[in-house]
């Protein structure tokens, strides 16, 4: 079992290589893959209390990191 990539921790984890526009970053195996290989997100119902639907981020978008951490580009956060 290839376990190495999943053992990277928090601030010690290197930022993923930015994905090209047709690719998304898979957080579980930690590399860029074709966006079509990741599950299609389901739309959130109107008025849902969660602000974080599983939608693919564009390559220029990022997920906010904790205080003092650089935001990491994570296209394909599903």
């Amino acid at each position: 079992m290839r376990r190495g990539p999943r053992s990277l921790r928090g601030r010690d984890a290197p930022a993923p290589t930015p994905c090209v526009p047709a690719e998304c970053f898979d957080l579980l195996v930690r590399h860029c893959v074709a966006c079509g290989l990741l599950r299609t997100p389901r739309p959130k119902p109107a008025g849902a209390s969660s602000p974080a639907p599983r939608t693919a981020l564009q390559p220029q978008e990022s997920v906010g990191a904790g205080a003092g951490e650089a935001a990491l580009p994570l296209p394909g956060l599903l």
Partner: antibody, heavy 117, light 111 residues
Framework: EVQLVESGGGLVQPGGSLRLSCAAS????????WNWVRQAPGKGLEWVGY???????YYNPSLKSRFTISRDTSKNTLYLQMNSLRAEDTAVYYC???????????WGQGTLVTVSS | DIQMTQSPSSLSASVGDRVTITCRAS??????????MHWYQQKPGKAPKLLIY???DLESGVPSRFSGSGSGTDFTLTISSLQPEDFATYYC?????????FGQGTKVEIK
């Protein structure tokens, strides 16, 4: 909506083998992560392993040597091959699908495997 | 392996009560600014149901009385006002590091 239907469970003798199937509809098993999770009677949940979009498999190390996950993309079906079964493998086996942070949002109804002589 | 410890293992509560279940991981389950922590509800004879993903995101279709919080190693599932259909067993799960692991479960029973 994804629907998962497991089959193949039943009674098997210690040392025997069994292959479980999980037929998926509503999404392709060539996308995302497809898991097996088991639950012994009256006990908690235990992750068995997954196969992902690329066919890469990851296993619970305690089970890897005896259990193998595979798929048939033409049938959109996931399999769990279980060998050298022991009494402690008696459980309900579920298949479930994950997004790429691992949460399992769709589950099958489960299939019971009983290992007993 | 990351060990997940839930507390309490069981609790008795009444309809309308506020219920809090905690889950502690043996090491941080955070990465990339995300908590790889999820919560499930399971009723007898049924498959688990996803309630909360990534520590605090409410799954589609789940009532808003369920909420999750926490980061790093300490997480909480809260039911703001317990309803009759909420009596069940609740599990936390981490997917930060292989093998993925679940807590031992918390059974919520009727007082």
């Amino acid at each position: 909506e994804v629907q998962l239907v497991e089959s193949g469970g039943g009674l098997v003798q210690p040392g025997g083998s069994l292959r479980l199937s999980c037929a998926a509809s509503g999404d392709s098993i060539t996308r995302g992560y497809w898991n097996w999770v088991r639950q012994a009677p009256g006990k908690g949940l235990e992750w068995v392993g997954y196969i992902n979009y690329s066919g890469t498999t990851y296993y619970n190390p305690s089970l890897k040597s005896r259990f193998t996950i595979s798929r048939d993309t033409s049938k959109n079906t996931l399999y769990l091959q279980m060998n050298s079964l022991r009494a402690e493998d008696t459980a309900v086996y579920y298949c479930a699908t994950s997004h790429n942070t691992g949460e399992m949002d769709y589950w099958g109804q489960g299939t019971l495997v009983t290992v007993s002589s | 392996d990351i060990q997940m410890t839930q507390s309490p293992s069981s609790l008795s509560a009444s309809v309308g009560d506020r219920v809090t279940i905690t889950c502690r991981a043996s090491e941080s389950v955070d990465d990339y600014g995300i908590s790889f922590m999820h919560w499930y509800q399971q009723k007898p004879g049924k498959a688990p149901k996803l309630l909360i993903y990534r520590a605090s995101d409410l799954e589609s279709g789940v009532p808003s009385r369920f909420s999750g919080s926490g980061s790093g190693t300490d997480f909480t599932l809260t039911i703001s006002s317990l309803q009759p259909e909420d009596f069940a067993t609740y599990y936390c799960q981490q997917t930060s590091k292989d093998p993925w692991t679940f807590g031992q479960g918390t059974k919520v029973e009727i007082k």
